[in-house]
């Protein structure tokens, strides 16, 4: 059953653990069949989600997947939050689960988590090149 | 064709630890989306849902078994293994894997035919 | 967690009658994307359970029209429009709003 819908893969109860002062990509990934939608991304505010102006964001496109992607560049401490992307597809639109972001200040860490750290503990992926990690639970 | 088997021993003594495989094809559990969830049913009893696995190996539980249980996910094998740890008499149910499909979260599209699984000492 | 009642628990029908089933949640089911995850399963005698419809009301692959399902927050129902000797057997509603996921203990349908 291959539906045409667009939809948002992300899932509920999605986290990330980030550190203040890195870059940081938050991915929205994205299925359509042949009109890419309209995606924008928001921060929650209580019960209400404010559209996220003037903030860099891009495209990447994979074989079966399109991932919005917005860039923290860097990271600051009051990015800390509950974000949602949102598409607009055929005047429908489409709210993904929130994914929520706890940003650790550098200054208040007293070290930088190191690669052999992260490696024992596997909860915490180690990405490319950058210091920054993700969390899951 | 989308199809869900699942496998392992029908009796297991009290303590022991249960491993079940779930073996499928039709579908990788590497496409955005997928995810395949173990759910229990005893003999004569309802539905129970256990732990999920989804795409990118993120994993949730029922928290009322969550100590007790393991799930991981072989994608070249496309295969799910469930253990559950200290069994007990009341554990005994026929056990069910079911394909998690997508439609803004998970909904059971597929299941397996079950395996009964038996605590007794 | 969130508990899923149904009633009533046996449901003897005449075929080629309408049968219906209530499946009430202890919790709304909307979920802040503005979904609501509301599933139903048939289980016929010794198979195991099929789905039937997804997001309250979503038919899902191969199920007949004369299927469908309603509802809204805490309150669904599953209708048979004509029950036929194929439709026996027991009906679960499952809620994958809150974690855990959870089942409605299950309705059986009979031919009386």
């Known amino acids: 059953k291959e539906s045409c819908d667009v939809q948002l893969y992300i899932k509920r109860q999605s986290e990330h653990s980030i550190l203040a002062g890195d870059p940081f990509e938050l991915e929205c990934p994205v299925k359509y069949c042949a009109n890419r939608p309209h995606v924008t991304w928001c921060k929650l505010n209580g019960t209400t989600c404010v559209k996220l102006e003037d903030r860099q964001t891009s495209w990447k496109e994979e074989k079966n997947i399109s991932f919005f992607i917005l860039h923290f560049e860097p990271v600051l401490p009051n990015d800390n939050g509950s974000y949602r992307c949102s598409a607009n597809f055929q005047s429908n639109l489409i709210e993904s689960h929130s994914t929520t972001l706890y940003v650790t200040d550098v200054k208040s860490a007293s070290e930088r988590p190191s690669k052999d750290e992260m490696a024992s503990r596997p909860w915490l992926l180690y990405r490319h090149h950058h210091h920054h990690h993700h969390h899951h639970h | 064709q989308v199809t869900l088997k699942e496998s392992g021993p029908t009796l297991v003594k009290p303590t022991q630890t249960l491993t079940l495989t779930c073996t499928f094809s039709?579908?990788?559990?590497?496409?955005?989306?997928?995810?395949v969830s173990w759910i229990r049913q005893p003999p004569g009893k309802a539905l129970e849902w256990l732990a999920h696995?989804?795409?990118?190996?993120?994993?949730r539980f029922n928290p009322s078994l969550k100590s007790r249980l393991t799930i991981t996910k072989d994608t070249s094998k496309n295969q799910v293994v469930l253990t559950m740890t200290n069994m007990d008499p009341v554990d005994t149910a026929t056990y069910y894997c079911?394909?998690?499909?997508?439609?803004?979260?998970?909904?059971?599209?597929?299941w397996g035919q079950g395996t009964l699984v038996t605590v007794s000492s | 967690d969130v508990v899923m009642t149904q009633s009533p628990l046996s449901l003897p029908v005449t075929l080629g009658q309408p049968a219906s089933i209530s499946c009430k949640s202890t919790q709304s089911l909307l979920d802040s994307d503005g979904k609501t995850y509301l599933n139903w399963f048939q289980q016929r005698p010794g198979q195991s359970p099929r789905s039937l419809i997804y997001l309250v009301s979503k038919l899902d692959s191969g199920v007949p029209d004369r299927f469908s399902g309603s509802g809204s927050g805490t309150d669904f129902t599953l209708k048979i429009s004509r029950v036929e000797a194929e439709d026996v057997g027991v009906y679960y509603c499952w809620q994958g709003t809150h974690f855990p996921w959870t089942f409605g203990q299950g309705t059986k349908v009979e031919i009386k």
């Open positions: 039709g579908f990788s559990l590497s496409t955005f989306g997928m995810g």
């Open positions: 696995i989804y795409w990118d190996d993120d994993k």
């Open positions: 079911a394909r998690g499909n997508w439609d803004g979260e998970t909904y059971f599209d597929y």
